[in-house]
């Protein structure tokens, strides 16, 4: 994750008291919440591995970087960070590994400067479509988010309540077109089987997209055409078998792109010919010399760049009358 780490050397720590105590008064400028460490010089508050069950109410107004990792938050309600006066400086919020399973509509409202949000390593079974947009309007006010880190947010399979997890995440990314300014999106390690076809077209500012360590089998219906700013596309450790001509042409047409394709089970048959030709010519694939065949068995571990058209054959399909059991 690219969330900032504090360079603060002078953290003040408050005396511990009930972590979920609610303060009716606005916080004093130099106040530090219970079970947290604060550095006004670094504009940083760290409430890390303290088993907090709610977001502290008395966060100092100066906070720019807020770490709430390794807690027991469970739920982020609407306005979880809304304060009077607002946390107008908060730019980076890290909530990773805090056992969140529910993020409600408007959870991040009233954070006008929030640029980086990390929700990784939380089993988000219930992510509201309006978690990031804050409203159910067809077009919402633009979110200030530039980086959204959602690695390993998939709940256990038996906890997905018969809903498409991919669909739930994408609904939150697209609601109200609020994330038009998003530049980095990380969705690694989420067991994604597919990428809904409309998602990338509606995130036109993306520079970095990480889809590594998922279960993507195909990119046939995914269009990269509009992502003219895309600089890195991580597709390592998926279940990709081949990239077809349309995808190859779109990737080649992106002016700044670097693509990462390692550790996919490439099927080296006649359908792979176009991809092999493209790999030999393109400069966009990083570590292309490491790509190897997984299937068929006779081709296992062959390097894609070393294949020629004679290597890439498809077994003829016998008519039913000639097939033997």
């Amino acid at each position: 994750s690219s969330s900032p780490t504090s360079s603060a050397s002078s953290f003040s720590s408050s005396a511990p008291f009930l972590a979920s105590a609610v303060s009716a008064q606005p916080p004093l400028p130099d106040q530090c919440p219970a079970l947290c460490e604060c550095s006004e010089a670094a504009r940083t508050v760290k409430c890390v591995n303290r088993n907090l069950t709610e977001v502290p109410t008395d966060l100092p107004a100066y906070v720019r970087n807020l770490f709430l990792t390794g807690n027991q938050l469970a739920v982020l309600p609407a306005g979880a960070f809304a304060r009077r006066p607002p946390l107008a400086e908060l730019a980076a919020l890290n909530l990773s590994g805090s056992r969140l399973d529910e993020v409600r509509a408007g959870a991040f409202e009233h954070l006008p400067s929030l640029r980086q949000l990390d929700l990784s390593h939380n089993p988000l079974a219930d992510l509201s479509p309006f978690a990031f947009s804050g409203s159910n309007a067809s077009v919402s006010a633009p979110s200030p988010l530039v980086e959204l880190i959602l690695n390993h947010i998939v709940p256990p399979e038996d906890e997905r309540q018969n809903r498409s997890f991919e669909g739930m995440v994408v609904a939150a990314l697209l609601a109200g077109r609020a994330l038009q300014g998003l530049r980095r999106l990380e969705l690694a390690s989420n067991h994604f089987l597919y990428l809904p076809r409309d998602v990338l077209a509606q995130l036109p500012s993306l520079r970095h997209l990480d889809l590594s360590n998922n279960s993507l089998v195909s990119l046939t219906y995914v269009s990269f055409r509009n992502l003219t700013h895309l600089e890195s596309l991580h597709l390592e450790d998926n279940a990709l078998k081949v990239l077809h001509n349309g995808t190859l042409a779109e990737l080649q047409g992106l002016p700044h792109i670097r693509v990462f394709l390692d550790n996919n089970p490439w099927v080296c048959d006649c359908h792979m010919a176009d991809m092999v030709t493209w790999l030999k010519e393109t400069e966009v694939v990083q570590g292309k010399d490491r790509l190897t065949c997984a299937y068929p068995e006779k081709m296992r571990n062959r390097v894609l760049l070393e294949l020629n058209s004679a290597d890439l054959d498809c077994d003829p399909i016998l008519p039913p009358s000639l097939q033997t059991s």
Epitope: N51, Q72, A74, R99, L100, P155, E159, Q161
Partner: nanobody, 122 residues
Framework: EVQLVESGGGEVQPGGSLRLSCAAS????????MAWFRQAPGKEREFVAA????????RYTDSVKGRFSISKDNAKNTVYLQMSSLRAEDTAVYYC???????????????WGQGTLVTVKP
């Protein structure tokens, strides 16, 4: 409506341990949190501990932190309360509850068991 059945109560000496169980008749998908409350004679029912079915987040009232541990077995639709270093003031009827919220209030929970009595005395 979910049926919640508590078991495991009994009499124990100060410093001893007990494990309470709460079995749900079915997995209450509409209830995201399972909790234990207790009610001592002549006192109000008070929150003890809670756990989330999915994320496994836990929370405790201050007086039991470090002594009690709440856990769950999703496959068995069962929640447990391991109680150690028991004190006389832990004597109460212990109730299992299920609800939507991540709260400590009685009103956060819609489904309740009948309770199991825990008595701590020399």
């Amino acid at each position: 409506e979910v049926q919640l059945v508590e078991s495991g109560g009994g009499e124990v000496q100060p410093g001893g341990s007990l494990r309470l169980s709460c079995a749900a008749s079915r997995r209450p998908f509409s209830s995201k949190t399972m909790a234990w409350f207790r009610q001592a004679p002549g006192k109000e029912r008070e929150f003890v501990a809670a756990v989330r079915w999915i994320g496994g987040a836990t929370r405790y009232t201050d007086s039991v932190k470090g002594r009690f541990s709440i856990s769950k077995d999703n496959a068995k639709n069962t929640v447990y309360l391991q109680m150690s270093s028991l004190r006389a003031e832990d004597t109460a009827v212990y109730y299992c509850a299920a609800g939507q919220a991540w709260g400590t209030k009685f009103t956060d929970y819609s489904d309740w068991g009948q309770g199991t009595l825990v008595t701590v005395k020399p």
